[in-house]
């Protein structure tokens, strides 16, 4: 902490500009103003601080706002937002998309920070659901933030908010979230017809029943392997070898090259050696 | 609730064939959703996975044993069973039988009984 | 084959302590990763399978988390009787492997 000094004459600053970048951290402390700093918030990226400077500039609004900031603060943080400590940001309250976004852009490209994961978890309790625009934002900065959420909290998302979901997005989710997010899905896409449902529930399907697989063995298909190998064991393992023809048409060829991994070795385990035979790929049960 | 039970000798002499048996009570051998594994540690070391079987009869063994090792399951006895050929003092081990259910894992395991190989 | 790499192969703690030991799979196993605690001249007991779902009966201070490569098994306070030797084990591929061990010593 900076010790308490009086600010030189002359020294006293009368707005935020680059002048400031030579004075030492007491005279930061002496003589910028925390209320004029509040109000110039949007310059303070412009200007080349030190670290040490911007320790400076935050004990002086932590001074100013004890309660934790405003929002037209907060909203001009830029990258004093990288001092900010979880416990700094579960004081703020932000209602703000735009103000969301600044502080998402500043932490661009490095993995999600404590206090990135704070930011967000505040502002979408703040909000009381994962609205399509926050999730169209949070994905776009983070494509894995979906599969970072507990299951608890995906049961927040709106089956609204799913046609925001791209299939990259879903890449880490294990069976328990996807087994909340595939009836969301569903009720999402209920009206798409067939061939088209079936692209944009594909990535979903790790938390389908067997009667949807069943269903889907049906429609011509043709499930790539990749999605097979996604789907949870429960579900696949009721399904009949005739059903997985069905429902993999050409790609069912890749059963061989999986048959040592599951669902793939589990489901092959408990079919009769007759009806594997049937797939001509050489698969021992 | 299902428990296992394995029983066979404690000691073996070198390059013959130590045999085990495990017995399972409180359950069937027959479970759909199970499969029945030999895993053994060595003293002071690790864990490592022998194979496993169906009560089909179907089999998949560590690739580094399979040469030496069968595993077969009698039904009717509720019970399935371990046979290493080719002992030497490496075998000398703790050999657990563990079931596998497919949507956990080894969720069951037997006390272990220790196998010793030694002339 | 899979093989599992575990670290470290033994830390000491104190009751109390947040304890994370983790589990690197030389190729993807998805999300397949169950964790073992064995203590001394007993059978290891399952904790968490699926890498992340907790066993029934174990206690929710056992916690697990990771996809693909990199696993996690965290112990937010470590209790009296948790310290023992944790195995990770990949059930995805056919080998069946398990990790090398993490022995949880008393500081």
């Known amino acids: 902490e900076v010790e308490k000094t009086a600010c030189p004459s002359g020294k006293k600053a009368r707005e935020i500009d680059e002048s400031l970048i030579f004075y030492k951290k007491w005279e930061l402390e002496a003589c910028v103003d925390a209320a004029l700093l509040a109000t110039q918030m949007d310059r303070v990226n412009a200007i080349p601080f030190t670290y040490e400077q911007l320790d400076v500039l935050k004990h002086k609004l932590d001074e100013l706002y004890p309660q934790g900031y405003p929002e037209s603060v907060i909203q001009h943080l830029g990258y004093l937002f990288l001092k900010m400590s979880p416990e700094d940001i579960r004081k703020w309250n932000v209602t703000s998309l735009e103000t969301l976004k600044a502080l998402l852009e500043v932490n661009k490209g490095h993995e999600m920070s404590p206090q990135v994961a704070t930011l967000i978890d505040r502002f979408v309790k703040g909000r009381g659901q994962l609205d399509k625009d926050t999730l169209d934002t949070l994905t776009a900065f983070y494509p894995g933030y979906l599969c970072s959420l507990s299951p608890e909290e995906l049961s927040s998302v709106p089956p609204s908010s799913i046609w925001a979901v791209r299939p990259q997005d879903l890449d880490t989710c294990d069976p328990r979230q996807l087994d909340v997010l595939y009836p969301k899905a569903r009720l999402a896409f209920q009206n798409m017809n067939g061939s088209e449902y079936f692209v944009k529930i594909q990535s979903f399907l790790g938390g389908a029943p067997t009667e949807d697989l069943k269903a889907l063995s049906q429609q011509n298909v043709s499930m790539d392997l990749a999605t097979f190998m996604k789907l949870r064991t429960d579900a696949v393992l009721p399904l009949t070898v005739a059903e997985v023809q069905k429902l993999l048409g050409p790609h069912v060829e890749g059963l061989k090259a999986e048959e040592r991994h599951r669902p793939v070795r589990d489901w092959i385990l408990r079919q009769r050696q007759d009806d594997l035979d049937t797939l001509g790929l050489g698969l021992q049960g | 609730q299902v428990q296992l039970q394995e029983s066979g000798p404690g000691l073996v002499k070198p390059s013959e064939t130590l045999s085990l048996t495990c017995t399972v009570s409180g359950g069937s051998v027959s479970s759909y959703y199970s499969t029945w594994s030999w895993i053994r540690q060595p003293p002071g070391k690790g864990l490592e996975w022998i194979g496993y079987i169906y009560y089909s009869g179907s089999t998949n063994y560590n690739p580094s044993l399979k040469s030496r090792v069968t595993i077969s399951v009698d039904t009717s006895k509720n019970q399935f069973s371990l046979k290493l050929s080719s002992v030497t003092a490496a075998d000398t081990a703790v050999y657990y039988c563990?079931?596998?259910?497919?949507?956990?894992?080894?969720?069951?395991w037997g006390q272990g009984t220790m196998v010793t190989v030694s002339s | 084959d899979i093989q599992m790499t575990q670290s470290p192969s033994s830390l000491s703690a104190s009751v109390g302590d947040r304890v994370t030991i983790t589990c690197r799979a030389s190729?993807?196993?998805?999300?397949?990763v169950n964790w073992y605690q064995q203590k001394p001249g007993k059978a290891p007991k399952l904790l968490i399978y699926?890498?992340?779902s907790l066993q029934s009966g174990v206690p929710s201070r056992f916690s697990g988390s990771g996809s693909g490569t990199d696993f996690t098994l965290t112990i937010s306070s470590l209790q009296p009787e948790d310290f023992a030797t944790y195995y990770c084990?990949?059930?995805?591929?056919?080998?069946?492997?398990f990790g090398g061990g993490t022995k949880v010593e008393i500081k």
């Open positions: 563990a079931r596998d259910n497919v949507f956990t894992g080894f969720d069951i």
């Open positions: 699926a890498a992340s």
């Open positions: 084990q990949q059930p995805y591929d056919a080998s069946y492997t």
């Open positions: 190729q993807s196993s998805r999300y397949y």
